[in-house]
């Protein structure tokens, strides 16, 4: 089948990086500047993506592959192929239509993106709060109150891991 197609359609012989030029007796012409064809047998070349504004060029366009963009510092990629850039916020904030806003009391965000999430409710697991939560950090749950009652095992739970210099607020 492929051999028959080649005989019937000369365009199928045009490799990636070229296009089948109808204006020139269907010969294979190189893609013009700022365009590409990633597969063979194409009748046109696609325009290269331009990484403008907050988009930065991660990979230059070539005759056989499109440019790839990422986002300038202070922004992060969203969507397939970094189709959008979204602003970063500080830890302890979330992005809203009114810009970056602090997490409400009882919620936290430990990343520069995403939304503020509620602190863990330790009591749902029958545990107590060992370290209070902040805007940037979730609470740390400790042993249940019963475990701390007189006569209970005196095994000391391991101290929670914390960032150097970070004290609970």
């Amino acid at each position: 089948f492929e051999r028959t197609r080649s005989l019937q359609d000369p365009c199928s012989n045009c490799p990636a990086g070229t296009f089948c030029d109808n204006n020139r007796n269907q010969i294979c012409s190189p893609c013009p500047p700022n365009s590409f064809s990633s597969a063979g047998g194409q009748r046109t070349c696609d325009i290269c993506r331009q990484c403008k504004g907050v988009f930065r060029t991660r990979k230059e366009c070539s005759s056989t592959s499109n440019a790839e963009c990422d986002c300038t510092p202070g922004f992060h990629c969203l969507g397939a192929g970094c189709s959008m850039c979204e602003q970063d916020c500080k830890q302890g904030q979330e992005l809203t239509k009114k810009g970056c806003k602090d997490c409400c009391f009882g919620t936290f965000n430990d990343q520069k993106r995403g939304i503020c999430r509620p602190w863990t409710n330790c009591s749902l697991d029958g545990k107590s709060v060992l370290v209070n939560g902040t805007k940037e950090r979730d609470v740390v749950c400790g042993p249940s109150p019963a475990d701390l009652s007189p006569g209970a095992s005196s095994v000391t739970p391991p101290a929670p891991a914390r960032e150097p210099g970070h004290s609970p607020q």
Partner: nanobody
Framework: EVQLVESGGGLVQPGGSPRLSCAAS????????MIWYRQAPGEKLEWVAN????????YYVDSVKGRFTISRDNATNSLFLQMNSLRAEDTAVYYC????????????????WGQGTTVTVSS
Amino acid sequence: EVQLVESGGGLVQPGGSPRLSCAASGFTLSNYWMIWYRQAPGEKLEWVANINQDGSEKYYVDSVKGRFTISRDNATNSLFLQMNSLRAEDTAVYYCARGGDGYSNSHYGMDVWGQGTTVTVSS
């Protein structure tokens, strides 16, 4: 081709009132949130203001509230930023950007940016 082209920048005296424009082409402006950003020399990009599809919602960064006004004219595919009482700290390159599909519902990402227009506030 989808593009945004800003204009209206230049050298402005402190207290001046330039109006920046952003001409959209290749898409229907009325379908999208639009956003102004700025980048002062040596600084990161800063969100300035945004406006929803029909102009009924407008939001501003605290430092420009009461001085800047974002508006749009969907009939002419244009976005504007009226800047009043300019200060030296408003000196920056100003960019307009298009909110991607789903902006304000599922994300606040921008998918199309202009090349920017420079506003220099100096006496």
